[in-house]
């Protein structure tokens, strides 16, 4: 039950996170005009990954796309790439995790397969979240650098008689959305990886070996106890020795790599 809850919660958290990453990527407010200690302009500038916008005092907003690819800063291209990779990995992760959900039955899919898929989606979510966090952080760093450069320009000589308005940009809403969304996707991925441990067949069972002592018939069965995973007892998945007779196929199980995650 706890494994199902962990997996389900991981899926939901990742879903919200990826929706947030998509939203952040599409948002125009990655950087917004800094209004503090600046000339008060009758226009408000803000920029996204794909276009820059200007809102006039009337509320009229005009946006212009970055129609050049080669003319854009390499950092911006890198941020775009990181966000897109994050979205793609997240989307694939979501697709995989839907089939991995314990509450969803697909044919006769074994728990080991579901565990594999859960782990795969978890790793994808982790990488997706890291991509988003990295992308947003790179952009934020770029903003901070440009901010202090433009501040320096603002307070040094203009060189000529004519002054130009130095528009400084600060963090926009999309950065915060991206950081939070990336964090959620990361947390969701970690939860999926944890859930995977509970889904995996936990025991390495061996064929029962009978030792016949003279006079008494006592069966000794090794490997019947294993430490708790911390997610409660999962009676549905664990093979519990009931001492009853069983076929060779029932008893035989192989160690899985998930036992050691």
């Amino acid at each position: 039950m706890a494994v199902t809850a962990c997996q389900g919660l991981g899926f939901v958290v990742s879903l919200i996170g990826i929706a947030g990453i998509i939203a952040a990527t599409c948002m125009d407010q990655w950087s917004t005009q800094d209004l503090y200690n600046n000339p008060v302009t009758a226009v408000f500038n803000y920029q996204g990954l794909w276009r820059s916008c200007v809102r006039e005092s009337s509320g009229f907003t005009e946006c212009r796309g970055y129609f050049t690819l080669l003319g854009l800063p390499a950092m911006l291209q890198a941020v775009r790439a990181l966000m897109i990779v994050g979205i793609v990995l997240g989307a694939i992760g979501l697709l995989v995790s839907i089939f991995a959900l314990k509450c969803i039955r697909i044919g006769s899919m074994e728990d080991s397969a579901k565990a594999n898929m859960t782990l795969t989606s978890g790793i994808m979510f982790i990488v997706s979240g890291l991509c988003a966090i990295a992308g947003v952080s790179v952009f934020a760093n770029m903003l901070v650098t440009n901010f202090w450069m433009s501040t320096a320009n603002m307070y040094t000589g203009m060189g000529g008689m004519v002054q130009t308005v130095q528009t400084r940009y600060t963090f926009g809403a999309a950065l915060f959305v991206g950081w939070v969304a990336g964090g959620l996707t990361l947390i969701g991925g970690v939860m999926m990886c944890i859930a995977c441990r509970g889904l995996a067949p936990e025991e390495t069972n061996y064929k029962a070996v009978s030792y016949h002592a003279s006079g008494h018939s006592v069966a000794y069965k090794p490997g019947g106890f294993k430490a708790s995973t911390g997610f409660g007892s999962n009676t549905k998945n664990k093979k519990i020795y009931d001492g009853g007779a069983r076929t060779e196929d029932e008893v035989q199980s192989y160690p899985s790599k998930h036992d050691y995650v």
Epitope: T41, A42, V43, Y46, V54, S57, S58, Q163, T167
Partner: antibody, heavy 119, light 113 residues
Framework: EVQLVESGGGLVQPGGSLRLSCAVS????????MHWVRQAPGKGLEWVAY????????YYADSVKGRFTVSRDNAKNSLYLQMNSLRAEDTAVYYC????????????WGQGTLVTVSS | DIVMTQSPDSLAVSLGERATINCKSS????????????LTWYQQKPGQPPKLLIY???TRESGVPDRFSGSGSGTDFTLTISSLQAEDVAVYYC?????????FGQGTKLEIK
């Protein structure tokens, strides 16, 4: 038809106060920023103040800052200019102007009301 | 504050001739975000309030005859009347609508020669 009608002008002594009003019709007043612009007799135009549609942004010319207060009542479709500590140089025709939708332009102007500051 | 300087102060042009009024700002009125210049031109006829002619330095307000055109960028702007008509006699003002306080030029009086 867009109409802006100023009122409240008149003769006032230096140091006195006056409140100008502007009644508007013909457009959704609450959606537009509004300006006050003045013109001294025989002189050029001087921008006085601006108030945004939701009153979040208010700006003044340096010459009137601290003495004039712009306000609006969207329910009454009215714009106001409270003028205190009036000086002789405040003598002018005061225009109520709508802020245009494009280019921060001043697109519709009232006929103006004359304010004379004299002893 | 941005200082707007118009030249000439007055101008006499024959009917049908081209009239050119210049406006210079002490700071650039160009906004890189949307590649627009925030300069507006107005026409004021005697005894009337001003009338909007051109915004964004070159975009004609609806209803304004196409003989009026605006040009320029950054700090230097021009209002051109391609073929002067009798009804164009007025004072013309340019205005900074980019940075508060918004400022007007001193005006250019256009007369018929």
């Amino acid at each position: 038809e867009v109409q802006l009608v100023e009122s409240g002008g008149g003769l006032v002594q230096p140091g006195g106060s006056l409140r100008l009003s502007c009644a508007v019709s013909g457009f959704t007043f609450s959606s537009f920023g509004m300006h006050w612009v003045r013109q001294a007799p025989g002189k050029g135009l001087e921008w006085v103040a601006y108030i945004s549609s939701g009153t979040t942004n208010i700006y003044y010319a340096d010459s009137v800052k601290g003495r004039f207060t712009v306000s609006r009542d969207n329910a009454k479709n009215s714009l106001y200019l409270q003028m205190n500590s009036l000086r002789a140089e405040d003598t002018a025709v005061y225009y109520c102007v709508r802020s245009g939708y494009y280019g921060n332009s001043l697109d519709y102007w009232g006929q103006g009301t004359l304010v004379t500051v004299s002893s | 504050d941005i200082v707007m300087t118009q030249s000439p102060d007055s101008l006499a042009v024959s009917l049908g001739e081209r009239a050119t009024i210049n406006c210079k700002s002490s700071q650039s009125l160009f906004n890189s975000g949307n590649q627009r210049n925030y300069l507006t031109w107005y026409q004021q006829k005697p005894g009337q309030p001003p009338k909007l002619l051109i915004y964004w330095a070159s975009t004609r307000e609806s209803g304004v005859p196409d003989r009026f055109s605006g040009s320029g960028s950054g700090t230097d702007f021009t209002l051109t009347i391609s073929s002067l008509q009798a009804e164009d006699v007025a004072v013309y003002y340019c205005q900074n609508v980019y940075i508060y306080p918004l400022t007007f030029g001193q005006g250019t009086k256009l007369e018929i020669k």
